[in-house]
């Protein structure tokens, strides 16, 4: 047959030759020829390639910069990049997690619906009728108003989304 015009999976076409791609974790040193195989070399320390490739340079592992609130979640290998996450109390600003911001706190009148993680911010929700939050917090949920009746007390001051009800003693002059 004549030299090929298309190649198999994990091969590439160059100079009318089907050459083997380099496996993940290795970079291309020289293309194959009529008489020689593709030559590949392992990526160095702190480098990686995550696909079958013909790259002549490996990629650098991501640096988890502590000055940006980042720390290593999973150390990179010759075949995988380093995965960064944020320090406690912080979360990533993007899917790539290139920097971190402090978790948002829920203001008074709002409670935590979902606690923040290393990759997602706090989700707040307004306290519904019957619930309140009087603090700014990244952890506190809306608390239910105190039930005066169960304490054999009466409501002296109505609750709001920011304050609890105020209970007081029963009026003893009741007929």
């Amino acid at each position: 047959p004549e030299p090929p015009t298309a190649c198999r999976e994990k091969q590439y076409l160059i100079n009318s030759q089907c050459c083997s791609l380099c496996q993940p974790g290795q970079k291309l040193v020289s293309d194959c020829t009529e008489f020689t195989e593709t030559e590949c070399l392992p990526c160095g320390e702190s480098e990686f390639l995550d696909t079958w490739n013909r790259e002549t340079h490996c990629h650098q592992h991501k640096y988890c910069d502590p000055n940006l609130g980042l720390r290593v979640q999973q150390k990179g290998t010759s075949e995988t990049d380093t995965i960064c996450t944020c320090e406690e109390g912080w979360h990533c600003t993007s899917e790539a997690c290139e920097s971190c911001v402090l978790h948002r706190s829920c203001s008074p009148g709002f409670g935590v619906k979902q606690i923040a993680t290393g990759v997602s911010d706090t989700i707040c929700e307004p306290c519904p009728v019957g619930f309140f939050s009087n603090v700014s917090s990244a952890f506190e949920k809306c608390h239910p108003w105190t039930s005066c009746e169960t304490k054999d007390l009466v409501v002296q001051q109505a609750g709001t989304n920011k304050t609890d009800v105020v209970c007081g003693p029963q009026d003893r002059l009741r007929a």
Epitope: P1, S20, V29, S30, D31, T33, E34, F35, T36, E37
Partner: antibody, heavy 112, light 112 residues
């Protein structure tokens, strides 16, 4: 078009060192490929002597018992053959080759 | 070493004949990637060898389609489908899978 051209003395005395040079044009010897020396005694078949790779590393035919050295001069795009302690059995046509392209060959006679 | 045995060592044939030359290796020429580096060359008297076939079955550029190669592992074949006057020459197989590279002893194709 890739071209290879052998040069060197056609007559070498027994026990001396045979030295040949191959000048390559149309392709850099540092780009890729293995650059070979092959010989053919009169009326006989072809014998691979060794190569120097694009990166400068070598491989030799063990049958030549450490008598062979292949080196290169990248500034001149040349590679060279040295064969020490020659005898009449080393009389042959010597070819330099990339295997897809060959020099025309040079005859070396070992005689006193 | 991979010893290469060609047969026949000589062959008489006529123009228009179909000719087959075989080459057998003492060990498999398939490498770990599944590639086999077996080549065929044609040499005419006083000339350098010319590459005909590389990697078992690939025709080198400019080689007529009447030349074809086949085989795998240890057994390989060069076929000339319809001999032309210019095809009378000596043919060599060469393996470059294993170092040292080794040639077959040659097959001389003569006019009957």
């Amino acid at each position: 078009e890739v071209q290879l051209q052998e040069s060197g003395p056609g007559l070498v005395k027994p026990s001396e060192t045979l030295s040949l040079t191959c000048t390559v044009s149309g392709y850099s010897i540092t780009s890729n490929y293995y650059w070979n020396w092959i010989r053919q005694p009169p009326g006989k078949g072809l014998e691979w002597m060794g190569y120097i790779r694009y990166d400068g590393s070598n491989n030799y035919n063990p049958s030549l018992k450490n008598r062979v050295t292949i080196s290169r001069d990248t500034s001149k795009n040349q590679f060279s053959l040295k064969l020490s302690s020659v005898t009449a059995a080393d009389t042959a046509v010597y070819y330099c080759a990339r295997l897809d392209y060959w020099g025309q060959g040079t005859t070396v006679t070992v005689s006193s | 070493d991979a010893q290469m045995t060609q047969s026949p060592s000589s062959l008489s044939a006529s123009v228009g004949d179909r000719v087959t030359i075989t080459c057998r290796s003492s060990q498999s020429l398939e490498n770990t990637n599944g590639n086999t580096f077996l080549n065929w060359f044609q040499q005419k008297p006083g000339k350098a060898p010319k590459l005909l076939i590389y990697r078992v079955s690939n025709r080198f550029s400019g080689v007529p389609s009447r030349f074809s190669g086949s085989g795998s592992g240890t057994d390989f074949t060069l076929t000339i489908s319809s001999l032309q006057p210019e095809d009378f020459a000596t043919y060599y197989c060469l393996q470059v899978t294993h170092v040292p590279f080794t040639f077959g002893q040659g097959t001389k194709l003569e006019i009957k």
